[in-house]
């Protein structure tokens, strides 16, 4: 059956934890992505940012997991109003910021 939202969010958090803990060389060769506003709709915004990183196996699972939280199909080059335009950060920092925010949501019981 379908995975409960709390389980899906926990699994996404655990995957981001795994990425941050196992990071040896610069994540995705130091690729830069658009920063996003961590507000409503941020799952799609996060996916829109990360989907523009290609050839980085470390975040492929995260990209797939985020697509499960985003109700519409996301493709490379697509940008929503949730991006902080003109502000790019390294993928590693993006992941850390997203991880902290998702933990906060998880602990507040906001699973969707």
């Amino acid at each position: 059956g379908p995975v409960p939202p709390s389980t899906a969010l926990r699994e996404l958090i655990e995957e981001l934890v795994n990425i941050t803990q196992n990071q040896k060389a610069p994540l995705c060769n130091g690729s830069m992505v658009w920063s996003i506003n961590l507000t409503a709709g941020m799952y799609c915004a996060a996916l829109e940012s990360l989907i523009n990183v290609s050839g980085c196996s470390a975040i492929e699972k995260t990209q797939r997991m985020l697509s499960g939280f985003c109700p519409h199909k996301v493709s490379a080059g697509q940008f929503s109003s949730l991006h902080v335009r003109d502000t790019k950060i390294e993928v590693a920092q993006f992941v850390k910021d997203l991880l902290l925010h998702l933990k906060k949501l998880f602990r507040e019981g906001q699973f969707n």
Epitope: E14, V17, Q21, K96
Partner: nanobody, 126 residues
Framework: QVQLQESGGGLVQAGGSLRLSCAAS????????MGWYRQAPGKEREFVAS???????YYADSVKGRFTISRDNAKNTVYLQMNSLKPEDTAVYYC????????????????????WGQGTQVTVSS
């Protein structure tokens, strides 16, 4: 929501020992630290010791060699074995769950604290 429950505090003579326990109910992620802080009357809360999921331990200089922190990941419990206690160790001891600060500092100076316990009183008489 995680709850932290401390136990093991009490009154002890200088040179004696106590073992504090802190049991956490709820989810603690593997990158998070569990640790102990203390606050003496009229003083600021200060770091005592911390431990991560992998068992790496960190101590304040004032307790090194006397206190030992350990963690049972299966039980989500952290312990603080306090030996050779001194009157200056008298304080309320608090358990905490926290993220290391952005530069990875495990001492919680700039950490993101998720949870604090209610505290347990340790009094060391001379």
């Amino acid at each position: 929501q995680v709850q932290l429950q401390e136990s093991g505090g009490g009154l002890v003579q200088a040179g004696g020992s106590l073992r504090l326990s802190c049991a956490a109910s709820g989810t603690i992620f593997v990158d998070e630290f569990m640790g102990w802080y203390r606050q003496a009357p009229g003083k600021e809360r200060e770091f005592v010791a911390s431990i991560n999921d992998g068992g790496s331990t960190y101590y304040a200089d004032s307790v090194k060699g006397r206190f030992t922190i350990s963690r049972d990941n299966a039980k989500n419990t952290v312990y603080l074995q306090m030996n050779s206690l001194k009157p200056e160790d008298t304080a309320v001891y608090y358990c905490a769950v926290f993220e290391p600060s952005p530069d990875g500092d495990p001492f919680g100076d700039r950490a993101w604290f998720w949870y604090w316990g209610q505290g347990t009183q340790v009094t060391v008489s001379s």
